[in-house]
Amino acid sequence: IWELKKDVYVVELDWYPDAPGEMVVLTCDTPEEDGITWTLDQSSEVLGSGKTLTIQVKEFGDAGQYTCHKGGEVLSHSLLLLHKKEDGIWSTDILKDQKEPKNKTFLRCEAKNYSGRFTCWWLTTISTDLTFSVKSSRGSSDPQGVTCGAATLSAERVRGDNKEYEYSVECQEDSACPAAEESLPIEVMVDAVHKLKYENYTSSFFIRDIIKPDPPKNLQLKPLKNSRQVEVSWEYPDTWSTPHSYFSLTFCVQVQGKSKREKKDRVFTDKTSATVICRKNASISVRAQDRYYSSSWSEWASVPCS
Amino acid sequence: RNLPVATPDPGMFPCLHHSQNLLRAVSNMLQKARQTLEFYPCTSEEIDHEDITKDKTSTVEACLPLELTKNESCLNSRETSFITNGSCLASRKTSFMMALCLSSIYEDLKMYQVEFKTMNAKLLMDPKRQIFLDQNMLAVIDELMQALNFNSETVPQKSSLEEPDFYKTKIKLCILLHAFRIRAVTIDRVMSYLNAS
């Protein structure tokens, strides 16, 4: 048993038929010695009396909020949560496996630049009795500080018959140098509590591997005289690391017809302009990627040809 | 990245072209190592990230763009002193820091070159003949070092008498290639920045 936060405890249980469970001793936080009784939130009966209560925690019926009382007055609470381990594997019932980039990916993270700021998100189909808390550090043996905000519900989607909820959190490395070469990964730890079930999820990454620039901005077309060609120009996104001559981007320019079946013309360039042929009803899209370290491409920025 | 990209102008800062070739070569070599050594821990997640230049050179600090010198977190250890007279330097414009930066890059290349050559010698003794270092990568390191053209004591190539542990050598190769790729990215960024200045 270990303390998750004040008055909230996690009991780690090996989950198999007729498992013996874990013996837990609860102590009432009071100077009182006599006349103390104990109750469990989901049952109205008195479980025991005295300053301590010994319980055998085997299943979810044994978890919950234990309260000690004296003469109708509440003295203190202890909330017991269960963390299930089956066949040596901790349960992952709360979050959805996003399966990208690989199976058992519950947390996904992205950074718009090298400032040490990143966002992580996760998915669940649960909407009630659910809480998250997030911690992060650089490295694990001698951790350096990363500060994370509160996890918030960032999107709700209908997937087939089901609602899916996306939660996200923003974190910032306390002392990040954008030019630094990372040798220790960022560790992100999410504590998830659904009802009386505790689970934890972790992700480990280098900022350089989760970079995804914002799309290029100010995408403009300038027709060239007596020609079907146009000059496309754009700018680095505002959120990208500076100076741009050090943190350089490379770009992909695509001309796409109205129909998805039409052949796409693509040009790659390190410049912030390109000359392309603009077909009728086509659109021109540009996306960006770190020039020297091939992490993710940005989303497309698009303008119609007409 | 196997994509059509325009070639650099000949009037560019001479080392930029070499540093781009270096990054391409080390990235290709790393990809080849990952594929060939697929049953070895050779991915970024699996290996220990070691920097053989740690405490010996300080390329990141010495080559920090001016704009980042205001960032406290970037100014951990800026005390470095290296001999200067590189041909990449457009002499009048060169600041003392730029000279330190380029000589630090040169020292990095020299250290990696020695490590890679030592490692290659061991890999050539492997009866499995599973993987060798790409001669192109070694040549590109050499070309960039020549372009930097610094005077520096030659580091003797390490030779070991004991029988090499080929498993360990291959793991070490992966560690070395990952670290060198990261350093090659920094070198490319620096050359791009200096070129723009």
């Epitope: 939130d41 989901q42 299943e59 979810f60 019926g61 919950g64 909020q65 909330l79 349960s91 019932d93 189909t125 649960i126 909407s127 009630t128 009795d129 089901n162 609602k163 009802k195 009386l196 079930k197 | -």
Partner: antibody
Framework: QIQLVQSGPELKKPGETVKISCKAS????????MNWVKQAPGKGLKWMGW????????TYADDFKGRFAFSLETSASTAYLQINNFKNEDTATYFC??????????????WGQGTLVTVSS | SIVMTQTPKFLLVSAGDRVTITCKAS??????VAWYQQKPGQSPKLLIY???NRYTGVPDRFTGSGYGTDFTFTISTVQAEDLAVYFC?????????FGGGTKLEIK
């Protein structure tokens, strides 16, 4: 002991509004969520949604968004269900049901006796 | 929404029999399943929560088991007062859905 007592049966014309009350006693009202469940004659149970008795925030199941409203009178430990623009298909027994615990909102440990609301044509 | 398919719809048994009702969820609901008993003209009563935990005061002849998508409710020795409709309910994901019910009749 813990009790949920609901208001009596109602006979409503289509288009009218009905408001059902559910008075709780025997526990701290604001510690436990209050759910509403519909049971059409001879049919199964359908969860309508719940109201957080501490914050007053209601949550509705998709089928009960729009014409249905949950509310509270905390000082009287009472929860309400209001149905606007009553329709034929709203004829049913409506139950209020208290959550099992502070941590388990949508398992129903205590139920009101039910309020039958019938449409009169 | 998650569909809870409860079988059988009807059960005609004699006192002393063992009865098993099953509930199949259309997707995994972990162990977030409850079982209720509704006697004629009454409101439902909670018997089992978290798939296998008996609620306070519920006789131990009532048991529940299961995880993921398949759940079972058992009355080890049926008694005359067990005449009722039994419902399963998933309380994993909103909307919290009930099975169609199993009507238990005593011969």
């Amino acid at each position: 002991q813990i009790q949920l007592v609901q208001s009596g049966p109602e006979l409503k014309k289509p288009g009218e509004t009905v408001k059902i009350s559910c008075k709780a006693s025997g526990y701290t009202f604001t510690n436990y969520g209050m759910n509403w469940v519909k049971q059409a004659p001879g049919k199964g149970l359908k969860w309508m949604g719940w109201i957080n008795t501490y914050t007053g925030e209601p949550t509705y199941a998709d089928d009960f968004k729009g014409r249905f409203a949950f509310s509270l009178e905390t000082s009287a430990s009472t929860a309400y269900l209001q149905i606007n623009n009553f329709k034929n298909e709203d004829t049913a027994t409506y139950f209020c049901a208290r959550s099992l615990s502070t941590m388990i909102t949508t398992t129903f440990a205590y139920w009101g006796q039910g309020t039958l609301v019938t449409v009169s044509s | 929404s998650i569909v809870m398919t409860q079988t059988p719809k009807f059960l005609l048994v004699s006192a002393g029999d063992r009865v098993t009702i099953t509930c199949k969820a259309s997707q995994s609901v972990s162990n977030d399943v409850a079982w209720y008993q509704q006697k004629p003209g009454q409101s439902p009563k909670l018997l089992i929560y978290y798939a296998s935990n008996r609620y306070t005061g519920v006789p131990d002849r009532f048991t529940g088991s299961g995880y993921g998508t398949d759940f079972t409710f058992t009355i080890s020795t049926v008694q005359a007062e067990d005449l009722a409709v039994y419902f399963c309910q998933q309380d994993y994901s909103s909307p919290y859905t009930f099975g169609g019910g199993t009507k238990l009749e005593i011969k």
